[in-house]
Interface confidence: low
Amino acid sequence: MGRARDAILDALENLTAEELKKFKLKLLSVPLREGYGRIPRGALLSMDALDLTDKLVSFYLETYGAELTANVLRDMGLQEMAGQLQAATHQGSGAAPAGIQAPPQSAAKPGLHFIDQHRAALIARVTNVEWLLDALYGKVLTDEQYQAVRAEPTNPSKMRKLFSFTPAWNWTCKDLLLQALRESQSYLVEDLERS
């Protein structure tokens, strides 16, 4: 296909340095369609237009990537650029409707991630949920998700809510949660690793 990718790249390359930075920051909090993960913040901030285009397409595929890019541009007040992007991607692309794309799959790694293997134990035994949320906020958790977890009354229900978002995460996102757990409750991780 490629048309949508070229249109995304064309739009991003036409942004000023300040606009590109603003685009990236908005991308961190823009609502995502269910089943899609968020590009990790650390990687995102250092990318130029070309890297960012590739990342958008690899995370969201071409059709949804273009739609998401247009949404962010529109949110920035760049309506004309958003319109041009959408027009370019709809010209005879022959793409399947955006709504039926599969979410990006986790990186191919053997077996279940530690986080998935020990889901029940983590729900029952993690006590420092606030720390985890602070660590994950803006990287893998959106504002809405962050608030939703915090709104839960108990630690287990907070963790259960947190796990409701993990099906959309890739391996890297789950690694971030594991790293946060190692830093906040290392004894728990060590205990589970031994089990």
Partner: antibody
Framework: RVQLQQAGAELVKPGASVKVSCKAS????????IYWVKQRPGQGLEWIGR????????NYNQKFEGKATLTVDKSSGTAYMQLSSLTAEDSAVYYC??????????WGHGTSVTVSS | DIVLTQSPASLAVSLGQRATISCRAS??????????IHWYLQKPGQPPKLLIY???DLESGVPARFSGSGSGTGFTLNIHPVEEEDAATYYC?????????FGGGTKLEIK
Amino acid sequence: RVQLQQAGAELVKPGASVKVSCKASGNTFNNYWIYWVKQRPGQGLEWIGRIHPSDSGTNYNQKFEGKATLTVDKSSGTAYMQLSSLTAEDSAVYYCALLSLYAMDSWGHGTSVTVSS
Amino acid sequence: DIVLTQSPASLAVSLGQRATISCRASKSVSSFGYNYIHWYLQKPGQPPKLLIYLASDLESGVPARFSGSGSGTGFTLNIHPVEEEDAATYYCQHSREFPWTFGGGTKLEIK
């Protein structure tokens, strides 16, 4: 950006308490941590603690536990910090600040608290 | 608690020259590949104003003459070229763990 409004000054007697307010404009008050910072005259900044308006969850600097109590009134979009058993050491400017992602990027203008008999 | 030591305590820089302020942490403030250090400026009678977050990210609306660098325990704020309006006290602050702490401040004077 959310604006934070604070009263200008409070004069209180030693041993008394004072309640400092911080009113947020805009309807995003419930989404962000509100932080409190102390600055004594001609001195640096000290982090007191934070409160999340959605559920009144708090984290305190141990140094200020028992001295500062953080509360919120969601209906009015106002955060409060009560300082108790005041001494001359508590004379300072107290700032509220809002953290949107990683750092405190919106600040009130500060409330000057003077403890004097 | 993590102690942040700023140096120098004060400095005077000629208009158009470079100002460099250092902030050293008593232990690493890096985690998850992020450097949890932020820089603020404060003018007399005003609240602090965020300049740089996560060691090197420029806050929206802050002039590009401000830049931050560093990782682990050592961080630097650079201002180049220095302008008249940059006369202020500069603070570093970490958010790596509770309690968050600030450096002692560096007072910048423009010659």
